[in-house]
Amino acid sequence: WELTILHTNDVHSRLEQTSEDSSKCVNASRCMGGVARLFTKVQQIRRAEPNVLLLDAGDQYQGTIWFTVYKGAEVAHFMNALRYDAMALGNHEFDNGVEGLIEPLLKEAKFPILSANIKAKGPLASQISGLYLPYKVLPVGDEVVGIVGYTSKETPFLSNPGTNLVFEDEITALQPEVDKLKTLNVNKIIALGHSGFEMDKLIAQKVRGVDVVVGGHSNTFLYTGNPPSKEVPAGKYPFIVTSDDGRKVPVVQAYAFGKYLGYLKIEFDERGNVISSHGNPILLNSSIPEDPSIKADINKWRIKLDNYSTQELGKTIVYLDGSSQSCRFRECNMGNLICDAMINNNLRHTDEMFWNHVSMCILNGGGIRSPIDERNNGTITWENLAAVLPFGGTFDLVQLKGSTLKKAFEHSVHRYGQSTGEFLQVGGIHVVYDLSRKPGDRVVKLDVLCTKCRVPSYDPLKMDEVYKVILPNFLANGGDGFQMIKDELLRHDSGDQDINVVSTYISKMKVIYPAVEGRIKFS
């Protein structure tokens, strides 16, 4: 019996087609992805093949103005239109709290939404009962297939799930649910979830009875043969893991942003054992036409976005200096504003010993692309912020050793004075540079804000200590020459859309007046 698994993950609000780098589509003839194009390909496969499942491994939420405006209603609407068969909850599905998951998505999805390792307690337990499930048995042709869901147990540090959801260890939570499916004589089981490729492989290895793992969170690109675009494969598709009980378990993921449709064909014997598996992600490029009816629906929903981008979010009573002449040479108040917003967006009081789990922010000055003048009645709009942060990036959470941070700050000024983008703006950090010293030895003082303290204060950076830092995904990926961050980071979790973080902060504060306050000094 043959099953075709079509899968997406980490779509992050890319409902419209995008450029090759998943930013805003500029030249339509070279654009990719989007739900209208995805629908064309899915329907083509459904017509050609008998047993097809369309699955999503989480993080539909967060990433463009679509999510900012529609808050998840767009996800339910278009996933319903594409007739997804099941979805696993990702960490970003909790970005607007549990209510922001329940009302727009859980109540409106016409397909099951899954996670076995999230347990509700207190008053939430009855409210959310039945709206998401640990597993689902789906009819496929004349057979049934079991799908078990899972979600990163780091979600309380990455999003806003509140205090009434407990995120358990994935493997511990999955095994009894798989066992239940086995007692129901369901012998073909897919683990669908959002914990990253390393955990996907562990689940394949450790959870008895799982036949296939469809994952997300780490934006992993797997491919067999010559890759069709810029993404470099982390391994073959499918990636085969040998389980502890000796089975070959295919593990797949389909990069991110709806650029590819994962396509995996699995052959099962009559006892539900995987005989063979093969496939590849399908690049959704312009050779695949956009479905006209879905495209028309997208255009209808778009109207509200255009109106939103010119509405006032808040006011500034000071000039927001985002000029290259400032942000690439010294502390600039636009950099301070953005870093303060980044920290504010990551306030998670999950431990009594810590006032917060993260206190530090770094931001490449080259990523700040425009100032905002206060003389327009102080008004700040989404459109203004899109000029400051035009690249459609995210502000991510990483863990780094102090020694890596020291290297990063040396890199920040290794060729100071040439208006290059690597000069770092900061939050929760006091740095002093001596430019008379040779490159690689210019940081004379680096103090960081404590987290395990009731009164935050600045202490000298410790080289061997592990620190959490919020930074742009561009830096986490080694951009602007920050190779040491990419090479030495100990953990990397994708965060919220950059503009969304700053706009939320400005809306919350209502009136802002960021200052230049001595975060960066020269001796």
Epitope: R83, K107, A109, G130, L133, K136, L138, V144
Partner: nanobody, 124 residues
């Protein structure tokens, strides 16, 4: 919470008719596939009929084809099973069940929510 309540069961003579109702509360009916199942004394639960969320497609077990009709009134959040030409072998407890998804099914494993059942006896 999601609830399904069946009604309309009773004693009927062979060749007679009954109309079972399944009233759904706690969710919108048009998001759910609904199935009718029955369990005769000492036998396995078996699928009788199912209706897709849109109401556009219906399935019937071979044993009831041409005699039973499933229908839904989404406005009233109610699903019906019209049973004609009843036979003694149609006797049992009839359950309605629901699940979110696109494809109706007669496989009980697919259904997530169940009613308490209503008893149907076909006897002279």
């Amino acid at each position: 919470a999601l609830q399904l309540v069946e009604s309309g069961g009773g004693l009927v003579q062979p060749g007679g008719s009954l109309r079972l109702s399944c009233e759904v509360s706690g969710f919108t009916l048009d998001y759910y596939n609904i199935g009718w199942f029955r369990q005769a004394p000492g036998k396995e639960r078996e699928g009788v009929s199912s209706s897709s969320a849109s109401g556009g497609s219906t399935y019937y077990a071979d044993s009831v084809k041409g005699r039973f009709t499933i229908s839904r009134d989404n406005a009233k959040n109610t699903v019906y099973l019209q049973m004609n030409s009843l036979k003694p072998e149609d006797t049992g407890v009839y359950y309605c069940a629901a699940y979110r998804g696109w494809h109706p099914s007669l496989d009980a494993r697919v259904y997530d929510y169940w009613g308490q059942g209503t008893e149907v006896t076909v006897s002279s």
